[in-house]
């Protein structure tokens, strides 16, 4: 069955619900664009999208706001060219993970830099921006295969959808196992894991819609205990 989506005329500052924009789109809504914050994941899918598209229509404000939305959607960006920087939230998330892992006091946290401390990741990963041209298809939340649309309509044309993907580095040191794991007691493996982001897609019945799709988002260490010899 087609998934539940919403119509137009919501407003939430961002061009598309929970999707960052970059480059040419920034000025579409004037200087105040982006001031309202992200739309809620619970909010209906298209509440924001057509505000930018419908020059002719007045909109009603979107009152919902959910900070968790950032974490899910920071890996998607609409842009006229390849984004130059990783998602800001991704960088913040990485830094937070370093701090949490170190379990330092608040006073130390403020002044310590993981890179200077020589910390190493348990699994080596690589991250890059990819387009729908690279992805072609993806799996949606219902397990169906959908086509990821390369272009997304905006008021002055179309922008490309970019996805910030993170996966295990096949050329890295940890391809044989996780770093720092006692090999006498544990079998370890670095595995790419996926999570859901919202993207404009088309299903097998040629129906275009905003759907959650799976993309590679991290490289994690999986352990199994070695049986006694």
């Amino acid at each position: 069955a087609p998934m539940k989506e919403a119509n137009i005329r919501g407003q939430g500052g961002l061009a598309y619900p929970g999707v960052r924009t970059h480059g040419t789109l920034e000025s579409v809504n004037g200087p105040k664009a982006g001031s309202r914050g992200l739309t809620s994941l619970a909010d209906t899918f298209e509440h924001v999208i057509e505000e930018l598209l419908d020059e002719d229509q007045k909109v009603r404000p979107n009152e919902e706001n959910n900070k968790d939305a950032d974490l899910y959607t920071s890996r998607v960006m609409l842009s006229s060219q390849v984004p130059l920087e990783p998602p800001l939230l991704f960088l913040l998330e990485e830094y937070k993970n370093y701090l949490d892992a170190a379990n330092m006091s608040m006073r130390v946290r403020r002044h310590s830099d993981p890179a200077r401390r020589g910390e190493l990741s348990v699994c080596d990963s690589i991250s890059e921006w990819v387009t729908a041209a690279d992805k072609k298809t993806a799996v949606d939340m219902s397990g169906g295969t959908v086509t990821v649309l390369e272009k997304v309509p905006v008021s002055k044309g179309q922008l490309k959808q970019y996805f910030y993907e993170t996966k295990c580095n096949p050329m890295g040191y940890t391809k044989e196992g996780c770093r720092g794991i006692d090999k006498r007691h544990w079998n370890s493996q670095c595995r790419t894991t996926q999570s859901y982001v919202r993207a404009l897609t088309m299903d097998s019945k040629k129906r275009i819609g905003w759907r959650f799709i799976r993309i590679d988002t991290s490289c994690v260490c999986t352990l199994t205990i070695k049986r006694g010899r």
């Epitope: 989506e5 598209l53 649309l149 309509p153 179309q158 129906r207």
Partner: antibody, heavy 121, light 108 residues
Framework: EVQLLESGGGLVQPGGSLRLSCAAS????????MSWVRQAPGKGLEWVAG?????????YYADSVKGRFTISRDNSKNTLYLQMNSLRAEDTAVYYC?????????????WGQGTTVTVSS | EIVLTQSPATLSVSPGDRATLSCRAS??????LAWYQQKPGQPPSLLIY???TRATDIPDRFSGSGSGTEFTLTISSLQSEDFAVYYC??????????FGGGTKVEIK
Amino acid sequence: EVQLLESGGGLVQPGGSLRLSCAASVFTFSNYYMSWVRQAPGKGLEWVAGINWNGAGDTYYADSVKGRFTISRDNSKNTLYLQMNSLRAEDTAVYYCAKQGVTHYNPMDVWGQGTTVTVSS
Amino acid sequence: EIVLTQSPATLSVSPGDRATLSCRASQGIAGKLAWYQQKPGQPPSLLIYDASTRATDIPDRFSGSGSGTEFTLTISSLQSEDFAVYYCQQYYDWPPLTFGGGTKVEIK
């Protein structure tokens, strides 16, 4: 104000052909799904055909017109078309073009004034 | 194909009174229902979408409600300009996009 203006209607004999046009203005035509809807004299609304914006020629038809009607669009001219072949008396109606949304799951928020097609011998 | 059944076919109401129009879908449509108003010689115009959201510039005397398969359009206090034909339409599962048969709201 957003506008849709249909043209091309008229009187045609059964078995004949007509091509309807719908000119769009004041919105980014190429971004939207578009549809044709008809209304026979004294009757209700009947959806005829739709087309998405994706450029791959993805079209959708009511069973009653499949194989006889063809919907198309020329984004460079901001124009929607309906080629009607093998016309029948029951195709007599006012034909409206309507704008939908970016995705498949949207109502028709802008309608044209309509053009009348009469199929009669 | 999703069939929409509107009732009543005709509703006779006095100006200032409340009018309640019903639309029943043959299967669930996840709230993807619109209401249109059509006056003689004019195209339809969008009143309500997503079952309950008023379209641009629609007065608040018009309200939509319902979910699943049962939907209602309520006009709280009928004005002279509200006497018209009202259609519901589903846009959840298509093709085909389907409309209800219409309800004519006439002056009592």
